[in-house]
């Protein structure tokens, strides 16, 4: 969490951002809130990016003002216009690119004063893993697949019964480049699994951590997946 305060001149207002991560090819949110103001027509929101000449986005007098917008963000940004009056300056970024990573500034002017806060935005790819029993294999084998990751993650297997065990000798992980030549498909196979046990396939890079669990018993198979972004710090 980053909390910024206003600059000299008018009163300062509190602006708060939260570091976040964007998933390449999907839409992302750059989070920013500020002390609300009931005078909507006086509110100005500017999003800037370090190293970029033009603005990322500008909202003033109740609407987008995009004449100064940088080419790299053209047609890809929007604020939640209906939420500005209650202090939400968050930016929606469409079709996140690898190059969108960097330091952003959320700069706010209201009738009460000015304020700004920076935000670190990471970009990459992350997806939920799915763990299945591989019936084609000669021995009891689990196959963990996740369609899109970048940068290349690490994959670690764990088991509820054999807690702390190292499965690197009985697992094999491969990374296959996807058609857009950036993200990769992750496939990890675990051999010699035992019945009545819960296995977890954990995939992690510097942006996200995802876990796929599978419980195999005589009568049924239960699966569960979970994904967590690693760098959500407020400012």
């Amino acid at each position: 969490l980053i909390i910024g305060f206003g600059i000299s001149g008018r009163h300062s207002i509190t602006v708060t951002t939260v570091a976040s991560a964007g998933n390449i090819g999907e839409d992302g949110i750059l989070s920013c809130t500020f002390e609300p103001d009931i005078k909507l027509s006086d509110i100005v929101i500017q999003w800037l990016k370090e190293g970029v000449l033009g603005l990322v986005h500008e909202f003033k007098e109740g609407k987008d003002e995009l004449s100064e917008q940088d080419e790299m963000f053209r047609g890809r940004t929007a604020v939640f216009a209906d939420q500005v009056i209650v202090g939400n300056a968050s930016l929606r970024l469409k079709n996140v690119q690898l190059t969108d990573a960097g330091t952003y500034k959320c700069y706010i002017i209201t009738s009460k004063g000015k304020g700004n806060a920076n935000l670190e935005y990471k970009t990459g790819a992350f997806s939920m893993p799915e763990v299945n029993v591989d019936y084609n294999a000669s021995s009891e084998t689990l196959r963990c697949e996740a369609p899109r990751w970048f940068p290349q993650p690490t994959v670690v297997w764990a088991s509820q019964v054999d807690q702390g065990a190292n499965f690197s000798e009985v697992s094999n992980t491969s990374f296959e480049l996807n058609s857009e030549n950036v993200t990769m498909k992750v496939v990890s196979v675990l051999y010699n699994v035992t019945i009545n046990n819960t296995y977890s396939c954990m995939i992690e890079n510097d942006i996200a951590k995802a876990t796929g669990d599978i419980k195999v018993t005589e009568s049924e198979i239960k699966r569960r997946s979970h994904l967590q972004l690693l760098n959500s710090k407020a400012s």
């Epitope: 609300p36 009931i38 005078k39 909507l40 027509s41 109740g62 216009a81 009056i85 209650v86």
Partner: antibody, heavy 117, light 107 residues
């Protein structure tokens, strides 16, 4: 869930003052504006003013400037509206209304103030 | 201050009718307009925000539209529980101002 609970009906004499309370629960009281709107019998809605409890910032409609005072007690999440120098045309129902997710999204049940000699 | 002119001030309609209420602002309010429904002895109920977005729990027979200075609330098929007074509110310019109200009565 969000609730705005106002104090009970009041009967006042001309020239007196009235203080209406509005107790809030269900959202962070200090971080969002609380407004006051009144409605005379059979009439429309009229905005009176607003307070930002976190900093006690206030904004008043010009018509009520100098006669209305908005305050907030952050320890009890209660907003207050005091109207002084009452006259018969101040007979109305007074509402508190929040701007939490949107402008005037939640309303108190209303407090009837009758000014009569 | 921005003036909001609401019309008609009252109308009579039957269950199943399509009802349209308009609000005109004295200047561009950039879609910063909400609609409220009020029944006798009750506080106003939040209906539509930012011109066209339905508040939580509001039936889909209600819809809002408009831009610039002209805005409309439409009830596609009037139900018995919709007989009430409707108000528009602009919050673009300070101070926020309400329309005069439209009373929807049973024909």
């Amino acid at each position: 869930q969000v609730q705005l609970v106002q104090s009970g009906a009041e009967v006042k004499k001309p020239g007196a003052s009235v203080k209406v309370s509005c107790k809030v629960s269900g959202y962070p009281f200090t971080s969002y504006y609380m407004h006051w709107v009144r409605q005379a019998p059979g009439q429309g809605l009229e905005w009176m003013g607003a307070i930002y409890p976190g900093k006690s910032d206030t904004e008043y409609a010009q018509k009520f400037q100098g006669r209305v005072t908005l305050t907030a007690d952050t320890s009890t999440s209660t907003a207050y509206m005091e109207l002084s120098s009452l006259r018969s045309e101040d007979t109305a129902t007074y509402y508190c209304t929040s701007t939490w997710t949107h402008y005037f999204d939640y309303w108190g049940q209303g407090t009837t103030v009758t000014v009569s000699s | 201050d921005i003036q909001m002119t609401q019309s008609p001030s009252s109308l009579s309609a039957s269950v199943g009718d399509r009802v349209t209420i308009t609000c005109q602002a004295t200047q561009d309010i950039v879609k910063s307009l909400n609609w409220y429904q009020q029944k006798p002895g009750k506080p106003p109920k939040f209906l539509i925000y930012y011109t066209a977005q339905l508040a939580e729990g509001v039936p889909s027979r209600f819809s809002g539209s408009g831009s610039g200075t002209d805005y409309t609330l439409t009830i596609s098929s009037l139900q018995s529980e919709d007989f009430a007074t409707y108000y528009c509110l602009q919050f673009y310019e300070f101070p926020p101002t309400f329309g005069g109200g439209t009373k929807v009565e049973i024909k």
